[in-house]
Structures are given as structure tokens and as C-alpha cells.
Amino acid sequence: LKGQEFAPSHQQVYAPLRADGDKPRAHLTVVRQTPTQHFKNQFPALHWEHELGLAFTKNRMNYTNKFLLIPESGDYFIYSQVTFRGMTSECSEIRQAGRPNKPDSITVVITKVTDSYPEPTQLLMGTKSVCEVGSNWFQPIYLGAMFSLQEGDKLMVNVSDISLVDYTKEDKTFFGAFLL
Amino acid sequence: LKGQEFAPSHQQVYAPLRADGDKPRAHLTVVRQTPTQHFKNQFPALHWEHELGLAFTKNRMNYTNKFLLIPESGDYFIYSQVTFRGMTSECSEIRQAGRPNKPDSITVVITKVTDSYPEPTQLLMGTKSVCEVGSNWFQPIYLGAMFSLQEGDKLMVNVSDISLVDYTKEDKTFFGAFLL
Amino acid sequence: LKGQEFAPSHQQVYAPLRADGDKPRAHLTVVRQTPTQHFKNQFPALHWEHELGLAFTKNRMNYTNKFLLIPESGDYFIYSQVTFRGMTSECSEIRQAGRPNKPDSITVVITKVTDSYPEPTQLLMGTKSVCEVGSNWFQPIYLGAMFSLQEGDKLMVNVSDISLVDYTKEDKTFFGAFLL
């Protein structure tokens, strides 16, 4: 690219420059979950820590009631990791009895709710069958990608089974987004 | 957003503009690990390639002695993948003998060391039970998230067992960070 | 950072400023794959949706014939998730017969093709042994990292077995890149 292509006088015409430190950003970390009602056929949403420890929200990116609220339109990188842990899945127990089986599974979905659409939009899904041999198992599912979001959109993280989420450490289960 | 909100004269007051190509960035790739002493109860740190092949450091982001050194304060996206491989885990061998068992596991931790804080801070952890049926197993753990770092902070990647790390290919095991 | 370090007059000398919204970006989502010929010992490449649903390309980042075409040199964050699903792997069937076995595996590779270089470069690889106990299994492999790319470079996603890729939902299998 030629330097003159992006001289300030030219840029202001079609796309304002902005300081990177001024962009909406959030990194949320896990907290102990309280069982909550959720819609039939919709996985429950996790709630998050937004200001203690490693967690933060800045530049008008707000967290409230399980949602990250997008304060300005643009392209965002969104990510989450959920660490699950459980006892031996039913699947392997059934198998020992010699019967065919459908595996148990763990699923994470990053969901967008927008005022212009009557259904949540699933942006990212990580889903894994769990058919463990050992008596205790644990494993993370990581997701991350870029999406075009609108001012006012809300983001949440849904999981297939809230009781399997490892809420013990802020570095194991987290959720974040930042304007590119 | 209105163009005038971000006119250069306004921006300079509260947050300097900067060229994106001038930001600290690094992508490090795996090398063969030399066994090193590490403190009891602390996972060993990996060392990395920082200039050959796909690896690079730029704009004052330096790599030295297993650490990435943060040259300026700001919000960074930090990521790593470690590919592990091993023989059948003890866990499944024990299980075949009919005894209950605690699964083996593999763990990756991205750790921050700060001069002003006596303890390393675990930023990200990926941990997985390994109870494999087959005689040889291999799998990656991927981590990535955004953190607010201070000039002088040091980042490293720790693993539960350095002997299980796949060091054969630069695309399988890597570590990186960039200023947003 | 001191404001004057990045005053416009200084910046223009060595690195042009540019509006973030003007940077090349793409998020591609899975479509049903048509079986295609591929060279022996080379994994087949996936093709993608580039404009419907969550998918988009912008600012001269173009998708054509399985490739993302890089329109300008710079540092890019590149990511992909591929969700695989299959029936019980041969590996566990063999094991039941009491024979030692080499596990089946699933692999994703993000590959760069450069006109000036005869061989494709593997940028990222996620590979996992699959030795599942249950009759149906499914799991994602996620990859993401930063690379210095040149104008004209082409990116693709290769997989070990195209028939195991879950193409049913745009949030399960995807591929993206953006200029930092």
C-alpha cells in the first residue's frame, strides 16, 4: 500500500480513524452457576465475572444478565472456552453391558440475540461426544471467530449441561470479544 | 459513529493513533525440548523457535529464555496450541485390570510473570483427561484469549509433561501474542 | 506511550495509518462437499460458503475455488474449526479382537500456497487419534494463529477425510482470516 493512500485527510472522508485503545473489549471469566430456567429446546446460558481477577469490560462494552452488549457496529472477534468435567458417562457403562449406544455429548454455543431477528442466531458451536473409559473425565471446548455485529446485539454462551461446567478457575472457562 | 468523533486532532488528546504494522507481535514454533529442572508442583515451561520458518518476533516483542517479553502496555491476544502424543495411558491399563482409576491428563497453561507480583498468574489453562483405548494416541489443546498486559510482563507456556509434547512440526505446537 | 510518539506527521513517514473497517477480512462457512480428486499423500481441500448466512468476504479479500486470496501483505490472524463425525473407528473394533492397533485419526491443516514457492506451506495442523468406544462419535478441531502473508498468497483448509466433515451447520465448521 502506498503511504499517501491513507493520509489522514483522505481517510476522514470515508472511514474515521480511531485509537485502538478506544475499542470495545471484554474478557469474562467463569463463576459458580446458579441453576436457572431456560427455554425449552434452548441450552442454558452461563453467567460470568466481568470485573474481578482477569475479567474486564471496557470502552462501552457492557456485561449484564448473562449477555455481552455490543455498543457499536463492526467486525468482532468472539471467543470462549468451556471446560467440562464429569463422572463416567452412561455411554461407557451401557457399553460394558454389551449393548449398542448413542454417546453422551457436551456442547458449547456462542449465540447472538438481535432486535431484528426473532430467534437467537448460533454463531459458533463446539460439540463433542463423550464416551470415556475412566471414572472421571474433563476436557475443554474452545471456539473463536470473527463476526459482523450491530450496535445493540447481545452475545451469550450456552451449554448443553450447566452442571458439567468447571467453574473452579478463571483460566479454564472464559468468554470474550473485541472490536477489530 | 460520526467522522468528527475520531478526527485526528481529537484523537491525539486522549489516545495516540498508531500504525498497525508497528505493533508488537510474535509467533513462536516448537523445537525439541531439552529436559530441564522445574520446581515441584510447577509445570515445566516450553522453549521455542523465534526466527526460523514460520516463527517471528517484531516491533520490540522479544523472546528470551522461554519467555515472551511484553514491550508496551495494552490489550494483547495470546494463543497457543500444544500437540501431545503418547502410548496407551496408565489409566486404561489399570482399567483393564478391573480397578477403579483416576485418569491421566494433559495440561497446557499460559502463564504471566510480573515483576511486581510474587506469584506467576495463570492466564489460560486447557486440561484434558486421557484414558485412551488405542496403543498410541495424539491430540492438540488450543488456547486463546485477550488480556491486559503491562510493559515488562513475561509470558510462557507450561505443560504437564514435557516428554509428551509433539515437537516434530512447527504447525502442530506453537505460541503467539499480538497487541490489539 | 507518549502521544507525540505517534503524531500523524511521524507516522506517515514509516507506516501509513488506515481505517480498521477497510482491512481485508473473511469468515467462510461449511457447505456440503462434493468428492473431488486429490493427489496421493495430499489431503483434500474443503470448499466454502462465502456470502450467505454468517459468511462474508470484504475489502478485497476474495474467495475462489477453495482458496482465500490475500489482497495485501501483512500480518493476518487465520483460524478454522472443522467438526468431524463418524461411526465407531476401526481402531476400537480391532482392539476388541485383542490385537494391538494404530489408532485412526482426524486431521485439519491450514495451508498456504505461494506462486513463488513450489510446495504448499502448512501453517497450522490439528491432528487427533480417534479410538472411540461409542457407536457414533463427533468432535471439533480448532486452529488459529498469526502469520505474515504476502499479497497473492492463497489459503485453504485441508482435511484427512472429507467424508467425516460435519457440513450440516454453519457454526460447526468454518474458516476465516483478517488483517491485523
Epitope: 449484564t64 452488549l69 440475540v113 431484528s116 431477528y117 426473532p118 437467537p120 445493540g152 | - | -
Partner: antibody, heavy 116, light 106 residues
Framework: QVQLQESGPGLVRPSQTLSLTCTVS????????MHWVRQRPGRGLEWMGR????????KYNPSLKSRVTITRDTSKNQVSLRLSSVTAADTAVYYC?????????WGQGSLVTVSS | DIQMTQSPSSLSASVGDRVTITCRAS?????MYWYQQKPGKAPKLLIY???NLASGVPSRFSGSGSGTDFTFTISSLQPEDIATYYC?????????FGQGTKVEIK
Amino acid sequence: QVQLQESGPGLVRPSQTLSLTCTVSGFDMVDTYMHWVRQRPGRGLEWMGRIEPASGHTKYNPSLKSRVTITRDTSKNQVSLRLSSVTAADTAVYYCVRSGGLPDVWGQGSLVTVSS
Amino acid sequence: DIQMTQSPSSLSASVGDRVTITCRASQGVGYMYWYQQKPGKAPKLLIYGASNLASGVPSRFSGSGSGTDFTFTISSLQPEDIATYYCQQWEGNPRTFGQGTKVEIK
């Protein structure tokens, strides 16, 4: 059962402020967005604005922005509309609408007449 | 503002007829919505995202289109379908509705 119920005075004097309240039941308001839409006699539908109840973030129709205010009280499960400096042209049926993340639901509407 | 031009403004058809209403946006929109409003009642959502049938809506209603041109169809008109139908875009600010199409039975 999901319900939205608009309430408020049916008659407002010109130049005064029109105030309506929407009380919701059967769902958690903070999971959605709440809108006000009006329909003037013999005319089509006009979107006035919306609020994101969890944060209070609002968006308004630019043609009404100087006169309209939408607020919420999540503890009472209520959303309120205020329209200042009304004229006869603001005579309409005012609807409270839920959207986002759940199927759209409209209240039955509240007729407000602006007259001296 | 994004202008929504709906046509026709009214139509008369027989029971069992196929009825088609079109809506043109002054600029491209991603999502289009279709509502039914009966006299003295609130509008009811029929179609969202251009082609998705809202819950509980009979399958004789359908929607199609993308960009600027959208179509709403009743495959077999029924007496209870007598109403005014509105298109709406929810993307630009402000959200805007078409002027409505009044459907009557011959």
C-alpha cells in the same frame, strides 16, 4: 402465558407529554428487546424506538428522536414511552412489541387521542 | 431511511386462489418480515428472515427474496386470511414498514 399490556391516558392535550406503560408477563424481559410502534388512523405502522432492557440501551426513530424517550423498570417488568410536545398528528394506537431471541409478540394496543 | 414499497395496495381474490404481494426496499436489506393485521387487532408476525414461517402459522403462507426484492405468497386463500399485510425491514434505523396490502375476498 406471554402477555404485553399497554396502559395510560386515552386523552392528552396538545403540547403536553404522552406517557404509556407496557407491563409484561410470562417471560424475562431482559432476555429480549422491547419496542414501541404506533399506527395513526387509516395509516400504516410506524416504529418509534426500542430499549434493550438489561442495559437500558435505546435506539429511536430519527424523525421522533427529539421528542421520544423509552425507559424500563425491570423490577416491575415494565417499559415506558414518553412522547413530548404532542399534536393532533400523534393521535394513534400505540403498541408495545417484544422482539429478539424469542418470537415477536405485540400488545393489544392503546388508543391515545390528542385533543384539546 | 430505507423506503419499503409494497404492491399492490389492495387486491381481491377468490377462496383457493394463489395471492402474491411484493415488497421492494430502497436499498438492500438482509431480513424481511411479513405481518398480518385484522381490523381492530394488533399485527401478527407470519414470516421472519424473508422465508421462515413463524410458530403456529399455517404452511399456506410463505416468503422469499433477498436484497431489495421480496415476495409474500398465500398459496390457497382462505376466508380467515382477509386482513391487511405489511412488510417490514428491521435493519436500517429507523425500522420501516410497507404501506400495507389489503386483501379481500371476491
